[in-house]
């Protein structure tokens, strides 16, 4: 059992047929000693005496809220959260597995940059009695600061017969250097509690691994004369590292049909601008990736070429 | 009628152990919370262990990880399996429906002595 916060505790236990559970403590915080009576949750039972007492957690029916009295006034409470083991591996129940980049992703994080700032999300089907908490570091033996902000529901999607939640969290890094090597990884811990489960999912990175550029700014197409080239030019996204001479992107250009089936025609460069042919009812779309670090690819900037 | 028949007890040496039993009968014995308190020579009724309609269990202090209370819901059966007696242990012992052991039987005495 340990403390998740002030009066909240977490009782670990292994998760199967008739497990005998563990045996958990209670001490009532209070300087009287006698006349002390405990109840658990809303039930008018009372479940024994003393200023401590000792208690069998074995199922969730064990769980919730623990509160001693003494006659009639409530003296404090606990609350008993459980975290469940089966078979050896800690519960996964509340989140869903995203599956990218590979199985049992929960937390998945971008940067948009190098300046230590990052987001991080993750998916539930849960729609009530949900808490998250975000804690974060550099390192893990001699942590250096990271400051998360509260985890929010950011959007809402039905798949299938399901509703599925998006909640997000943005992180800084206290004292983050861009152009530094990282050589420590940033270490991401959420705490999530469903009525009486707790779980914990980690998830370990380097910034420059999840670097997701915004995608180019103000992209423009024009004609060239007597010709179906045209020149297409960009800029770097505001939100991307300087200077752009040290922090540079590379680019691809690509004319897509109407149709999916149609032939792309895609162009790498390094410059802000490029020379392509526009066929009728075509558009060209622009992505951005870090040019030394093959972290992701930008989303598509497009414009029609009509 | 709510009957409870406690039986078990007896003449014990410090460090021994005991079974008691608590045999019940005229209501729903596995959906109650089950009880078994103590009234030691010349005091009130004290409060040992409860049992929950899940098994699960709570102890008083003066317990220590000695005793252990378990049902046999098959039976209408309470079990409370008294380990490391001290003489302090030394009273007359009920299973009850309520905490205040209100509901009880006649007990079964209990004496840990040299």
């Known amino acids: 059992i340990w403390e998740l916060k002030k009066d909240v505790y977490v009782v670990e236990l292994d998760w199967y047929p008739d497990a005998p559970g563990e045996m958990v403590v209670l001490t009532c915080d209070t300087p009287e000693e006698d006349g002390i009576t405990w109840t658990l949750d809303q039930s008018s039972e009372v479940l024994g005496s003393g200023k401590t007492l000792t208690i069998q957690v074995k199922e969730f029916g064990d769980a919730g809220q623990y509160t001693c009295h003494k006659g009639g006034e409530v003296l404090s409470h606990s609350l008993l959260l459980l975290h469940k083991k089966e078979d050896g591996i800690w519960s996964t129940d509340i989140l869903k597995d995203q599956k990218e980049p590979k199985n049992k992703t929960f937390l998945r994080c971008e940067a948009k940059n190098y300046s230590g700032r990052f987001t991080c999300w993750w998916l539930t089907t849960i729609s009530t009695d949900l808490t998250f908490s975000v804690k974060s570091s550099r390192g893990s033996s001699d942590p250096q600061g990271v400051t998360c902000g509260a985890a929010t529901l950011s959007a809402e999607r039905v798949r299938g017969d399901n509703k599925e939640y998006e909640y997000s969290v943005e992180c800084q890094e206290d004292s983050a250097c861009p152009a530094a090597e990282e050589s420590l990884p940033i270490e991401v811990m959420v705490d999530a509690v469903h009525k009486l489960k707790y779980e914990n999912y980690t998830s370990s990175f380097f910034i420059r691994d999840i670097i997701k550029p915004d995608p180019p700014k103000n992209l423009q197409l024009k004609p060239l004369k007597n010709s179906r080239q045209v020149e297409v030019s960009w800029e770097y996204p505001d939100t991307w590292s300087t200077p752009h001479s040290y922090f540079s992107l590379t680019f691809c250009v690509q004319v897509q049909g109407k149709s999916k089936r149609e032939k792309k025609d895609r162009v790498f460069t390094d410059k802000t601008s490029a020379t392509v042919i526009c066929r009728k009812n075509a558009s060209i779309s622009v992505r951005a990736q870090d040019r030394y670090y093959s972290s992701s690819w930008s989303e598509w900037a497009s414009v029609p070429c009509s | 009628e709510v009957q409870l028949v406690e039986s078990g007890g007896g003449l014990v040496q410090p460090g021994g152990s005991l079974r008691l039993s608590c045999a019940a009968s005229?209501?729903?014995?596995?959906?109650?919370?089950m009880y078994w308190v103590r009234q030691a020579p010349g005091k009130g009724l004290e409060w040992v262990s409860t049992i929950k309609p899940n098994g699960s269990t709570a102890y008083a202090d003066f317990v220590k990880g000695r005793f252990t209370f378990s049902k046999d819901n098959a039976k209408n059966t309470l079990y409370l399996q008294m380990n490391s007696l001290k003489p302090e242990d030394t009273a007359l012992y009920y299973c009850?429906?309520?905490?205040?052991?209100?509901?009880r039987g006649q007990g079964t005495q209990v004496t840990v002595s040299s």
């Open positions: 009850s429906t309520d905490y205040a052991g209100t509901v």
């Open positions: 005229g209501f729903a014995f596995s959906n109650r919370w």
